[in-house]
């Protein structure tokens, strides 16, 4: 099976790498614009220069292209706790990240929120916090893991998953109750 190419990819594949086919004259291959620039005018003829202009402030192109407009710079999302790691330049988009001791949680492919790394109170760090993953905690005896926090087994209801982890404690509590009724 031959992979289906879009019209633009079909047009570009006729020309050597770094060039694109003139939209009005398919016998002409124009040189693509460098990153940091965009296409202002197609080349007038073979061997003639493409008219490329530098992206204006607040916009960029990160690779060679024949775009009619530069791309708008991304903004870091304050409401998601994001901070700017590096600002937008003509050839690179803004890079957003999280503060120290925070990790990124991706709600979707292009949307992340910053959360504080778990400290594993009443437990130990099994895996350290990473850029895209929270700390993995192991809880001390008498505690169970709930939403990545070590919670006392006294908060374990019999219907919850914690009953397996807290079984000795639950039995003890039950035993104490029983001994009081004899």
């Amino acid at each position: 099976l031959v992979p289906h190419l879009g019209d633009r990819e079909k047009r570009d594949s006729v020309c050597p790498q770094g060039k694109y086919i003139h939209p009005q004259n398919n016998s002409i291959c124009c040189t693509k614009c460098h990153k940091g620039t965009y296409l202002y005018n197609d080349c007038p003829g073979p061997g003639q220069d493409t008219d490329c202009r530098e992206c204006e402030s607040g916009s960029f192109t990160a690779s060679e292209n024949h775009l009619r407009h530069c791309l708008s710079c991304s903004k870091c999302r304050k409401e998601m706790g994001q901070v700017e790691i590096s600002s937008c330049t003509v050839d690179r988009d803004t890079v957003c990240g999280c503060r120290k001791n925070q990790y990124r949680h991706y709600w979707s492919e292009n949307l992340f929120q910053c959360f504080n790394c778990s400290l594993c109170l009443n437990g130990t760090v099994h895996l350290s916090c990473q850029e895209k993953q929270n700390t993995v905690c192991t809880c001390h005896a008498g505690f169970f893991l709930r939403e990545n926090e070590c919670v006392s087994c006294s908060n374990c209801k019999k219907s919850l998953e914690c009953t397996k982890l807290c079984l000795p404690q639950i039995e003890n509590v039950k035993g104490t109750e029983d001994s009081g009724t004899t």
């Epitope: 999302r77 304050k78 409401e79 998601m80 949680h105 709600w107 929120q113 959360f115 504080n116 929270n134 939403e147 990545n148």
Partner: nanobody
């Protein structure tokens, strides 16, 4: 007690419009960024849109960009989602929620309102 109550869902034809509302109570609405998420039949939760405290910064999933508009009225403690050019794939239960703060889970969200797009 935090309460979020969605309304405005229903059956609509492809290309039609709906406006969802979410009435909030039990917390200071103006202090919280708010989210719309949806769950299509047999699928997981999908982040649709969110809005900051004052209604200035908004975000839209690529699947709804240019068709949906999120807004809020802090004087009425209400969140809105205007849905235009609806498609069959927009069929889902829509939930409003408070943007999570402590971890990647929704502590507070509503009971949902069903949107069905069908001819």
């Amino acid at each position: 007690e935090v309460q979020l109550l969605e309304s405005g869902g229903g059956l609509v034809q492809p290309g039609g419009s709906l406006r969802l509302s979410c009435a909030a109570s039990g917390f200071t609405f103006a202090h919280e960024p708010m989210v719309w998420v949806r769950q299509a039949p047999g699928k997981g939760l999908e982040w649709v849109s969110h809005i900051d405290r004052v209604g200035q910064d908004t975000y839209y999933a690529d699947s709804v960009k240019g068709r949906f508009t999120i807004s809020r009225d802090n004087s009425k403690n209400t969140l809105y989602l205007q849905m235009n050019s609806l498609r069959a794939e927009d069929t889902a239960v829509y939930y409003c929620a408070i943007l999570p703060k402590r971890g990647p889970r929704f502590d507070y969200w509503g009971q949902g309102t069903l949107v069905t797009v069908s001819s």
